[in-house]
Interface confidence: low
């Protein structure tokens, strides 16, 4: 805590400008205006304080809305924004995507901070659910963003926004979370014909069900090996291998190196040792 | 019941090398994220580096990035972490954890609902 002192004369700031960083933290305390601050925030970004000067503005800004920021502050917060803690961000009321890209892009490149946490979360419930914009925006800056809600969070992603996912973005996801997305999914690319349809579904199918592994087994699909691991083991137990021959296509050949590891491991297990020879791949029930 | 036992702890110079290892049982491996995480005397735990199922998405510290490295066998229930070059403040009790709680980072500590009991590693100047 900065102690109250009177501001030296001619000292006053009239401005936030570059000859604020020669202050010392208690002339910043007695010399700039809380008033003034909040409307020149978009200046600070632009002058090197120091991170005890910017814990003195940011004392300021608390001292002014101790409700919590007005979002014409907020969006200019820039490098101030690392001083938050999630407790300050809770009091905020963030509605503007744009605001939203102004604070992640200060963050950016590092692993999402409880602040950021925080602030998504606020964000996603002032909207009432993810809409396509918005996850557009969070997994352009966090791609592992989808796969760090909960099954219950997922559930409110609308499938229209599922068009705005990457396959990168669902690398980190779990069974659990796959499972809800999966049907999303379907549901988002249905009016989609056969191959572009698998190139859409193909990341999200750790979260299929076995009737909907054999419906794409007869569409000449051929199905990657790293596809088909991700697979639940549950989905691909019931397949027969001339399902799993169909769903792979050429790529079949790759169930020899990958026969010690599920879910392969697990298939070749519940076949017929008469129906695996006829891959010819010397694989043993 | 989940298991997870932490071994390849022990005493070295910095700049030397060790690999921790995890043993998983209990619980469907090849469908969980693993997480390694540290514990140094009278710090709080931390976590250190963390592995998705589909060994995609690998993320660590910003403290260790460049010097561990963690793998895992699902054939084997293994998970891994390769320490190089390492620095008297890596000193610590390390822990294997798993079943990542849906919401979270990947090295949020809690994050994790099942741990090891930890092995120690110890480097010395």
């Known amino acids: 805590e900065v102690e109250k002192t009177a501001c030296p004369s001619g000292k006053k700031a009239r401005e936030i400008d570059e000859s604020l960083i020669f202050y010392k933290k208690w002339e910043l305390e007695a010399c700039v205006d809380a008033a003034l601050l909040a409307t020149q925030m978009d200046r600070v970004n632009a002058i090197p304080f120091t991170y005890e000067q910017l814990d003195v503005l940011k004392h300021k800004l608390d001292e002014l809305y101790p409700q919590g920021y007005p979002e014409s502050v907020i969006q200019h917060l820039g490098y101030l924004f690392l001083k938050m803690s999630p407790e300050d961000i809770r009091k905020w009321n963030v509605t503007s995507l744009e605001t939203l890209k102004a604070l992640l892009e200060v963050n950016k490149g590092h692993e999402m901070s409880p602040q950021v946490a925080t602030l998504i979360d606020r964000f996603v419930k002032g909207r009432g659910q993810l809409d396509k914009d918005t996850l557009d925006t969070l997994t352009a800056f966090y791609p592992g963003y989808l796969c760090s809600l909960s099954p219950e969070e997922l559930s409110s992603v609308p499938p229209s926004s599922i068009w705005a996912v990457r396959p990168q973005d669902l690398d980190t996801c779990d069974p659990r979370q796959l499972d809800v997305l999966y049907p999303k999914a379907r549901l988002a690319f249905q009016n989609m014909n056969g191959s572009e349809y698998f190139v859409k579904i193909q990341s999200f199918l750790g979260g299929a069900p076995t009737e909907d592994l054999k419906a794409l087994s007869q569409q000449n699909v051929s199905m990657d090996l790293a596809t088909f691991m991700k697979l639940r083991t549950d989905a691909v137990l019931p397949l027969t291998v001339a399902e799993v021959q169909k769903l792979l296509g050429p790529h079949v050949e790759g169930l020899k190196a990958e026969e010690r590891h599920r879910p392969v491991r697990d298939w070749i297990l519940r076949q017929r040792q008469d129906d695996l020879d006829t891959l010819g791949l010397g694989l043993q029930g | 019941e989940v298991q997870l036992a932490e071994s390849g702890g022990g005493s070295v110079q910095a700049g030397g090398s060790l690999r921790l290892s995890c043993a998983a049982s209990?619980?469907?491996?090849?469908?969980?994220?693993m997480g390694w995480f540290r514990q140094a005397p009278g710090k709080e735990r931390e976590g250190v580096a963390a592995?998705?199922?589909?060994?995609?998405?690998?993320v660590y510290s910003d403290s260790v990035g460049g010097r561990f490295t963690i793998s895992r066998d699902n054939t084997k229930n293994m998970v891994y972490l390769q320490m190089n070059n390492l620095e008297p403040e890596d000193t610590a009790m390390y822990y294997c954890?798993?079943?990542?709680?849906?919401?979270?980072?990947?090295?949020?500590?809690?994050?994790?609902?099942?741990w090891g009991q930890g092995t120690q590693v110890t480097v010395s100047s």
């Open positions: 592995i998705p199922y589909t060994s995609t998405g690998i």
């Open positions: 209990g619980f469907t491996f090849s469908r969980n994220t």
């Open positions: 954890a798993t079943d990542r709680r849906p919401g979270t980072t990947m090295l949020a500590v809690n994050g994790y609902n099942h």
